[in-house]
Amino acid sequence: MMTGTIETTGNISAEKGGSIILQCHLSSTTAQVTQVNWEQQDQLLAICNADLGWHISPSFKDRVAPGPGLGLTLQSLTVNDTGEYFCIYHTYPDGTYTGRIFLEVLESSVAEHGARFQIP
């Protein structure tokens, strides 16, 4: 039975050209995490495997950094980075847990005028 829950940073915004940390946390379960996949829509961004460590997908190598922890740092943000991001926890024995984060990348001027939001 899957008892765990994923807590995420929820809906976040960041400035174009800046960076943002995507963070998920699995709680309320004793399941062991074998691997965490980070995906944008259906595209793989990165993998953190308990045995083999981190892998950043080739198309994102220049702009994605592993961590902190099981999180992911997106750098040099563009408006095209706006969208849904998913952390997928592969665990034993529970199975798969998925968390969702919505990122909005704003033009710097808009962000400076207080349009930044964060919903837990």
Epitope: T34, I47, D51, L52, H55, Y92
Partner: antibody
């Protein structure tokens, strides 16, 4: 269509060398852990070696350690197995295999195999 | 070295249900070890062909594999069940598991399934 195509097998004398290649197509090669698995005539499957996404981590079966070297060229979507100091017991069909995105889950795509015969 | 043990042969008649067992030493399946020791996969090898993945992650079926094939796992033992047996199911079946302690994959010896 996801495909793996092995080549490089043949007849070699004991003590000789051979390099097997596996050309991958239909998937983002860089994002997957790969393995070589062999099958001696009339026998079962035996795992030979595994390589991570970048090639920085490699594992070997005890029976080939120190003699075989696994490598990959992600720019060419190709997996290799360099086999040195070959013995009669290395005679087998050699398969390359793509792992599931969580590599511990299993090997989801296999090539058709290439035959290696070690004999004088 | 860890070992996965399978019966060398199994048989059944068309329409029947057959199960193939795969028992392992504690370190490659038993639940008291860390997660990457636990995943059992099953492969079908028809005569003269490459192996094909039937079950991954103990119980998951890849797309395209009929739901007649199912996997289960309990403690140090895993099992592949085939229901509604068909003549084309006649093949060798192999279980495998990642052995995290040894950083290696271990295959069972294989089971030859005969459809009578």
């Amino acid at each position: 269509e996801v495909q793996l195509l092995e080549s490089g097998g043949g007849l070699v004398q004991p003590g000789g060398s051979l390099r097997l290649s596996c050309a991958a197509s239909g998937f983002t090669f860089d994002d997957y852990v790969m393995s070589w698995v062999r099958q001696a005539p009339g026998k079962g499957l035996e795992w030979v070696s595994l390589i991570n996404w970048s090639g920085g981590t490699t594992y070997y079966a005890d029976s080939v350690k120190g003699r075989f070297t696994i490598s990959r060229d992600n720019s060419k979507n190709t997996l290799y197995l360099q086999m040195n100091s070959l013995r009669a017991e290395d005679t087998a069909v050699y398969y390359c295999a793509k792992h599931w995105i969580v590599y511990q889950y299993g090997m989801d795509v296999w090539g058709q195999g290439t035959t290696v015969t070690v004999s004088s | 070295q860890s070992v996965l043990t399978q019966p060398s042969s199994a048989s059944g008649t068309p329409g029947q249900r057959v199960a193939i067992s795969c028992s392992g030493t504690i370190s490659n399946i038993e639940t008291k070890y860390v997660s990457w020791y636990k995943y059992v996969s099953w492969y079908q090898q028809l005569p003269g062909t490459a192996p094909k993945l039937l079950i991954y992650n103990n119980v998951q079926r890849p797309s395209g594999v009929p739901d007649r094939f199912s996997g289960s796992q309990s403690g140090t033992s895993a099992s592949l069940a085939i229901s509604g047996l068909q003549s084309e199911d006649e093949a060798h079946y192999y279980c495998a598991s990642w052995e995290g302690g040894l950083n290696s994959w271990v295959f069972g010896g294989g089971t030859k399934l005969t459809v009578l």
